[in-house]
């Protein structure tokens, strides 16, 4: 497995009082049984609300690399291939669960963390506020 | 804490050979530091590729209930509010980490699992295959 510079303050896995702590098997089982799940694949280019993917890396987190979507335009692409500003490209955001090494650099001690990621973009009708 | 009918085969938290196992603090930390993350909120109704949320339940998983996006139409909604079948509504999928009790019914032993979920839909230009 991976060797991590060990923090001398790492908690003892056998400490009965280690707060709100459980054993987690990291031999990750992949339930994506569909042999061709056809993930968002090339949708980021073909969408009427296209997006770019940006790499976010953090070695103290699992997964350490998360790809974030950023919508390319404020508006959406119309049938002529132009940006239509009467519509809005917006990110679809989702909280995901990650593991963070805590204390830092401990090879076998983690904390669950929720982070908000943008998964892709969709085209929506804008909310128009009418001023009296 | 909670009383769970205990599986006699639960691994010993102190077993040095328990495979690829780490201590995880379940006090979930919220890293959503953005002051206005504006999650997907009402986009499922306002999108040109609207979606419904469908319930998927599994009592041995956390979260036990996962609401999955299913695109409402094969096509996309045009400016007149009609479905345009020259475009396609497609699901944006994301792999997420969930926790599974393993062995089942063990109160303090879990396994990380990756599952693919549809978090929303986007409108894409179809791939047209021309037959010679």
């Amino acid at each position: 497995g991976i060797t991590i510079p060990r923090n001398p303050g790492c908690p003892n896995s056998e400490d009965k009082n280690f707060p709100r702590t459980v054993m987690v098997n990291l031999n990750i089982h992949n339930r994506n049984t569909n042999t061709n799940p056809k993930r968002s694949s090339d949708y980021y280019n073909r969408s009427t609300s296209p997006w770019n993917l940006h790499r976010n890396e953090d070695p103290e987190r699992y997964p350490s690399v998360i790809w974030e979507a950023k919508c390319r335009h404020l508006g959406c692409i119309n049938a002529d291939g132009n940006v239509d500003y009467h519509m809005n490209s917006v990110p679809i955001q989702q909280e995901i669960l990650v593991l963070r090494r805590e204390p830092p650099h401990c090879p076998n001690s983690f904390r669950l963390e929720k982070i908000l990621v943008s998964v892709g973009c969709t085209c929506v009708t804008p909310i128009v506020h009418h001023v009296a | 804490g909670i009383t769970i009918p205990r599986n006699p085969g639960c691994p010993n938290s102190e077993d040095k050979n328990f495979p690829r196992t780490v201590m995880v603090n379940l006090n979930i930390h919220n890293r959503n530091t953005n002051t206005n993350p504006k999650r997907s909120s009402d986009y499922y109704n306002r999108s040109t590729s609207p979606w419904n949320l469908h319930r998927n339940e599994d009592p041995e998983r956390y979260p036990s209930v996962i609401w999955e996006a299913k695109c409402r139409h094969l096509g996309c909604i045009n400016a007149d509010g009609n479905v345009d079948y020259h475009m396609n509504s497609v699901p944006i999928q994301q792999e997420i980490l969930v926790l599974r009790r393993e062995p089942p019914h063990c109160p303090n032993s879990f396994r990380l699992e990756k599952i693919l979920v549809s978090v929303g839909c986007t409108c894409v230009t179809p791939i047209v295959h021309h037959v010679a």
Partner: antibody, heavy 126, light 107 residues
Framework: EVQLVQSGAEVKKPGESVKVSCKAS????????ISWVRQAPGQGLEWMGG????????DYAQKFQGRVTITADESTTTAYMELSGLTSDDTAVYYC???????????????????WGQGTTVTVSS | EIVLTQSPDFQSVTPKEKVTITCRAS??????LHWYQQKPDQSPKLLIK???HSVSGVPSRFSGSGSGTDFTLTINGLEAEDAGTYYC?????????FGPGTKVDIK
Amino acid sequence: EVQLVQSGAEVKKPGESVKVSCKASGGSFSGYGISWVRQAPGQGLEWMGGITNFFGIVDYAQKFQGRVTITADESTTTAYMELSGLTSDDTAVYYCARDPNEFWNGYYATHDFDYWGQGTTVTVSS
Amino acid sequence: EIVLTQSPDFQSVTPKEKVTITCRASQNIDSDLHWYQQKPDQSPKLLIKYASHSVSGVPSRFSGSGSGTDFTLTINGLEAEDAGTYYCHQSYSLPFNFGPGTKVDIK
């Protein structure tokens, strides 16, 4: 349809303890949490604490820390709230509420209280 | 600890009138705010979740808006059965506390 049914009214003396039960039916008990909320006569709602059934994790409001114990039994799908060292200020209606913990619309685990028990009146009087 | 304040404390309203109740958080809570209705001698009932999401079985005259620190519950066309106390509740961070409530009665 989830239903939460609480135990009956209790009359206690100062210094005693009270244990209120909340029997859940419908839905997967291990999948959600149960929170306890109290309401003194003519007052607002006060969150006391809650349990995430899947992990058995309990959180308490600081005001009640050391005096309240929240537990749950998955085999009987019942949650319990025990409050010790009762005083007249603890006279209130005690409610259990379901905390869905669902992966929904951008949230990894939701925390709205979507179902409530009917309430248990606890009267503390000498 | 996040503190929620509501205004007004009390509102006396004529049927069919529009009612607006506001809830302010002492710090940013994203859209992690919920609204409950409590009628006399009844348990609270969830009306709106996550600031603006309607709840199944709740009449469409109830709507919510806002994010960050300022939130609004609107009742469009009050009906006699809407009399009761309305509470906001945050689930952004522990403890998951409630606002002090707004009592609505019918003139």
